[in-house]
Interface confidence: low
């Protein structure tokens, strides 16, 4: 429905608090280097303008699109050229090209300092001093570091962040109360950001059809009692929401997400029996809860799929009349019967089915041609099952840290051109699949593991896209969204790679390693491991293990020494020499 003033419409729908928060997120996701104060100023100006439009929708400029209003505001930033370089050229363009230009300049790995958590008392003072500014800073710092973070979900995180400080800053032991909550929010936030990044990549790199297919499969698993038409309606609405958020239309996205939650709760009887608790919560919690809700029970006595999709004489007729609807029905029916499959596996099966029908419906005897299509599914199902079984066994044998190290070696050998920080980050995250998924029973392992791996490999893809260095990574990332993981799994050692020259400086360590947290110390050691493999890609597991064991012993010894720095200098030289000898460097 058309509104005279889009900005007034959204302000009224969302309310001032959410309006301001979402505009701040939008601006911080576009201009990631701008200081907080500059963004707050811009947001306040937009908010004051929106209020004039609420009072009089016919007032000057109130009829302009949100992209025009926001883009004009962003282009008033004085230091645009100095801070952002060619991004400033976006301002010479007209909408919609200007917004597209801003979107293209979003940086998944912005050059921003690591967020260091201050002392609890310092944070509590800041919170008590000016709660509103404190929470705005949270939104700003997360949004600028995660330019695709799902904005309405970030509002939910901010609400929990506020609740944590409200409760813990008056607790007897503030730190014991607050720090675990902040750790949980940080970890959940990173996971949420990465999941949303995959949705945006799916939409932007592979198109709406790819995203809709993903949504059909996931919602059919989650709501197996819902009719196909109901699932289709939810998929259409969900696609609109994510298209808007990924496109920077955060006000529309948040508004539409609220409408979708309202619709789901008003129609929960025809969607899922698991929604009752979610639907009793306030808006932000409700939307989050629906997004995370467990799968409903499968209806009893579902008929065999073969009748409609293999045995029927009308398969080719049905396919020809409405290809996407027919394939959508196939995906819906298959997914609702298989909560034990990953979404990407379901999409591979649907793709195989589509390819078979394309070929067979043009053949002399279509039925004879596609009669065995379900047999083609068997190896596709067994491949991830076997891979997960093997890797969970390895994880249980090694534990998370050493399992991560095994993956570091594996992936460095596959794609040694990728930067060391990216290999460490991605391999550490790949390794977390063990503790995240291997504890689950068989029926939940694959959807947990393979869909998580899709999210992590997408991180590799978006980081690599910024600075492409490996044709193999580009190939696996761009050829097929659903086959990314099998593509990376199939990569062998890159025989074309010329080993990196040995540089002793890379393996020189100092006493500061002793004061690092366990996690940071692991990252240091894993960075060294990647560099070792880059120097000696043909090193055996045994050789690498021996060097890493020596390295761990060296760190432990020097951290216990009275003169740590001297120990690191002298023992470090010996370690480098011994490692070179052991690896034949």
């Amino acid at each position: 429905d058309a509104h005279k003033s889009e900005v007034a419409h959204r302000f009224k729908d969302l309310g001032e608090e959410n309006f301001k928060a979402l505009v701040l997120i939008a601006f911080a996701q576009y201009l990631q280097q701008c200081p907080f104060e500059d963004h707050v100023k811009l947001v306040n100006e937009v908010t004051e303008f929106a209020k004039t439009c609420v009072a009089d929708e016919s007032a000057e400029n109130c009829d302009k699109s949100l992209h025009t209003l926001f883009g004009d505001k962003l282009c008033t930033v004085a230091t645009l050229r100095e801070t952002y370089g060619e991004m400033a050229d976006c301002c010479a363009k007209q909408e919609p090209e200007r917004n597209e230009c801003f979107l293209q300049h979003k940086d998944d790995n912005p050059n921003l300092p690591r967020l260091v958590r201050p002392e609890v008392d310092v944070m509590c003072t800041a919170f008590h001093d000016n709660e509103e500014t404190f929470l705005k800073k949270y939104l700003y710092e997360i949004a600028r570091r995660h330019p695709y973070f799902y904005a309405p979900e970030l509002l939910f995180f901010a609400k929990r962040y506020k609740a944590a400080f409200t409760e813990c800053c008056q607790a007897a032991d503030k730190a014991a109360c607050l720090l675990p909550k902040l750790d949980e929010l940080r970890d959940e936030g990173k996971a949420s950001s990465a999941k949303q990044r995959l949705k945006c990549a799916s939409l932007q790199k592979f198109g709406e059809r790819a995203f809709k297919a993903w949504a059909v499969a996931r919602l059919s698993q989650r709501f197996p009692k819902a009719e196909f038409a109901e699932v289709s309606k939810l998929v259409t609405d969900l696609t609109k929401v994510h298209t808007e958020c990924c496109h920077g239309d955060l006000l529309e996205c948040a508004d539409d997400r609220a409408d979708l939650a309202k619709y789901i709760c008003e129609n929960q009887d025809s969607i899922s029996s698991k929604l009752k608790e979610c639907c009793e919560k306030p808006l932000l919690e409700k939307s989050h809860c629906i997004a995370e809700v467990e799968n409903d029970e499968m209806p009893a006595d579902l008929p065999s799929l073969a009748a409609d999709f293999v045995e029927s004489k009308d398969v080719c007729k049905n396919y020809a009349e409405a290809k996407d609807v027919f394939l959508g029905m196939f995906l819906y029916e298959y997914a609702r019967r298989h909560p034990d499959y990953s979404v990407v596996l379901l999409l591979r099966l649907a793709k195989t089915y589509e390819t078979t029908l394309e070929k067979c419906c043009a053949a002399a005897d279509p039925h004879e041609c596609y009669a065995k299509v379900f047999d083609e599914f068997k190896p596709l199902v067994e491949e991830p099952q076997n891979l997960i079984k093997q890797n969970c066994e390895l994880f249980e044998q090694l534990g998370e840290y050493k399992f991560q190290n095994a993956l570091l070696v594996r992936y460095t050998k596959k794609v040694p051109q990728v930067s060391t920080p990216t290999l460490v980050e991605v391999s550490r995250n790949l390794g977390k699949v063990g503790s995240k998924c291997c504890k689950h029973p068989e029926a939940k392992r694959m959807p947990c593991a393979e869909d998580y791996l899709s999210v992590v490999l997408n991180q590799l893809c978006v980081l690599h896209e910024k600075t492409p260095v490996s044709d193999r990574v580009t190939k696996c990332c761009t050829e097929s969204l659903v086959n990314r993981r099998p593509c990376f799994s199939a990569l062998e050692v890159d025989e074309t790679y010329v080993p990196k020259e040995f540089n002793a400086e890379t393996f020189t360590f100092h006493a500061d390693i002793c004061t690092l947290s366990e996690k940071e110390r692991q990252i240091k050691k894993q960075t060294a491991l990647v560099e070792l493999v880059k120097h000696k890609p043909k090193a055996t597991k045994e050789q690498l293990k021996a060097v890493m064991d020596d390295f761990a012993a060296f760190v432990e010894k020097c951290c216990k020494a009275d003169d740590k720095e001297t120990c690191f200098a002298e023992e470090g030289k010996k370690l480098v020499a011994a490692s070179q000898a052991a690896l034949g460097l």
């Epitope: 310092v122 003072t125 800041a126 001093d129 710092e141």
Partner: nanobody
Framework: EVQLLESGGGVVQPGGSLRLSCAAS????????MLWVRQAPGKGLEWVSV????????YYADSVKGRFTISRDNSKNTLYLQMNSLRAEDTAVYYC????????????WGQGTLVQVSS
């Protein structure tokens, strides 16, 4: 223009005491939380103590708890740090700063005053 001027530093023996002052101007002192930070030779910045605009609550780094006391006089726009039982590891340049700011760093600080604890 915001100005913060620290004073009261000097050389003191271990176990001795010093009182640092910080005169503030150019902003509304009584609506700003303030803090003391210090930088030991060759080390990074370390926060020492924070005081809310009203005078309470106050917070201290573990390393100075029970030995240092932060206070303020809003009528004089002045921040204080009473340092007792000084140790060699308290040797540093002490800065007063206005708090908070956009990046959980300190908005404005003074030139600092050197505290040297040695026998």
């Amino acid at each position: 223009e915001v100005q913060l001027l620290e004073s009261g530093g000097g050389v003191v023996q271990p176990g001795g005491s010093l009182r640092l002052s910080c005169a503030a101007s150019g902003f509304t002192f009584d609506t700003s939380s303030m803090l003391w930070v210090r930088q030991a030779p060759g080390k990074g910045l370390e926060w020492v103590s924070v005081i809310h605009q009203s005078g309470t609550p106050t917070y201290y780094a573990d390393s100075v708890k029970g030995r240092f006391t932060i206070s303020r006089d809003n009528s004089k726009n002045t921040l204080y740090l009473q340092m007792n039982s000084l140790r060699a590891e308290d040797t540093a340049v002490y800065y007063c700063a206005k708090f908070p700011s956009s990046r959980m760093k300190f908005d404005y600080w003074g030139q600092g005053t050197l505290v040297q604890v040695s026998s």
